[in-house]
Amino acid sequence: YNNFRKSMDSIGKKQYQVQHGSCSYTFLLPEMDNCRSSSSPYVSNAVQRDAPLEYDDSVQRLQVLENIMENNTQWLMKLENYIQDNMKKEMVEIQQNAVQNQTAVMIEIGTNLLNQTAEQTRKLTDVEAQVLNQTTRLELQLLEHSLSTNKLEKQILDQTSEINKLQDKNSFLEKKVLAMEDKHIIQLQSIKEEKDQLQVLVSKQNSIIEELEKKIVTATVNNSVLQKQQHDLMETVNNLLTMMSTSNSAKDPTVAKGEQISFRDCAEVFKSGHTTNGVYTLTLPNSTEEVKAYCDMEAGGGGWTIIQRREDGSVDFQRTWKEYKVGFGNPSGEYWLGNEFVSQLTNQQRYVLKIHLKDWEGNEAYSLYEHFYLSSEELNYRIHLKGLTGTAGKISSISQPGNDFSTKDADNDKCICKCSQMLTGGWWFDACGPSNLNGMYYPQRQNTNKFNGIKWYYWKGSGYSLKGTTMMIRPAGF
């Protein structure tokens, strides 16, 4: 027994001593060097930390725990052997001594030993559970890492595939761009060639235009000569008429001997006895300025002063403010009498305005306004109309109330555009309005869907360009 105690001491383990009577029992149990120190007591049901230890540390710790378990197992076996041996000896001693009390001591010692063993077993179970828990945790971590790695590998593969696709697309687009560039260069060359051709054409046209302008100048000069001749002829005719009137003064007392003949309008010409259609010289009272006007002495009782006529497109009506003011064209053909003369005339007494229209299908219509006058130039020759009757529409195609007169160089309309430039010709444009009798002249079969034709909406509708128009005035009381 002493021998055993000595060998146990030499190992240097913790001693458990029980003193009973003359006998003293000493048990040596192994110390777990690698277990927790007393400063941080072990709690079997402690919550594990969230972040697991690094993989290598965990492996090392597992190995240490395995070693400890192995040691503990060996110690337990030794302890069992020792207890068995010791019990045999004790039983012999008990039997020899036959001391009843010693039995109780032995039971107590046994109980203590069993308790110690149970405690050790519990601790071992806890350690085992901990090891198992840690192992499971590590396995899970490894699995997660494995899955994550797989996922990353898949993503890398997908990205690589995507990059390849993009590279293919990029190269395709590069080819396309190059092809387009080539095409563009060819087109540019083609455009340049066309431009050069057009420039040649423009040069040719310019020279033709110059020729035409020269011809126009010549024609204008000839026209002026003809007009002068006509004027002279008219004067001669008037002189002859005067002479005839003078010789027949007894028969016609209306013209006294030596009286100067001048007519303000065709109504006066008609009343003086000139009842044939034709061009007459008109002069405003208290004025020396003369104008040539065509007089219609047949329609509706005669005495009509023609202030506008369109019939064949021979005269350009896209004229300046000044030209529309003084008048232009040929009184026996297409012409505009002149805004200034008409303004002065219609402000001296009340006049009616009749607009006679012809379409390309052989139809005729008219609009009659019972009161018409133009404002002065300061008020842009604004048109004033009242009392519409006639067959060319129940609604006035000249916008009401009247608008200012506009020409290509005088924009007095109510449009954000310039109506005179857009529709051509001078007119009392609104924005731009239902009429324009000074628009472009279009021949038959080319006269529909026109944006700038000779228009009278409330008779022929939009886009219909008329064949002929006549605007005529006469005193209201004629």
């Epitope: 109510k414 449009c415 954000i416 555009c417 109506c419 857009m422 609104d430 924005a431 731009c432 309005g433 239902p434 869907n449 026109k450 944006f451 034709g453 228009k455 909406y457 409330y458 939009s462 886009g463």
Partner: nanobody, 129 residues
Framework: DVQLVESGGGLVQPGGSLRLSCAAS????????IGWFRQAPGKEREGVSS????????YYADSVKGRFTISSDNSKNTVYLQMNSLRPEDTAVYYC??????????????????????WGQGTLVTVSS
């Protein structure tokens, strides 16, 4: 020469749909406004919808708002009128017409009927069960 040709008319049941086309030639849509008009027997011609390409604005008559949609395709020089939820009172001859976009009175957005100078021949739309 300026020309407008309508197509797409026909017989359709109430609640049905039709798409009218107006093909323009002789001018480009950029500088013009295109209007759709209709005329029922014995009635006045009335404006249905208009589109102005230079600023993208559109106009609809109260009677067709929410049912009709006007659009244009400049590459085809064509204007369309998509007509949904058709009613018997939509029965009429439908015309498209053109007006220079700038022909606008100061302060106004759309054009009187008489400003539309170019017209198509029309296409008949009949809504009946």
């Amino acid at each position: 020469d300026v020309q407008l040709v309508e197509s797409g008319g026909g017989l359709v049941q109430p609640g049905g749909s039709l798409r009218l086309s107006c093909a323009a030639s002789g001018f480009t849509l950029d500088d013009y406004a295109i209007g759709w008009f209709r005329q029922a027997p014995g009635k006045e011609r009335e404006g249905v919808s208009s589109i102005r390409d230079n600023d993208g604005s559109t106009y609809y008559a109260d009677s067709v708002k929410g049912r009709f949609t006007i659009s244009s395709d400049n590459s085809k020089n064509t204007v369309y009128l998509q007509m949904n939820s058709l009613r018997p009172e939509d029965t009429a001859v439908y015309y498209c017409a053109a007006v220079p976009a700038g022909r606008l009175r100061f302060g106004e957005q759309w054009y009187p009927l008489y400003e539309y100078d170019a017209w198509g021949q029309g296409t008949l739309v009949t809504v009946s069960s």
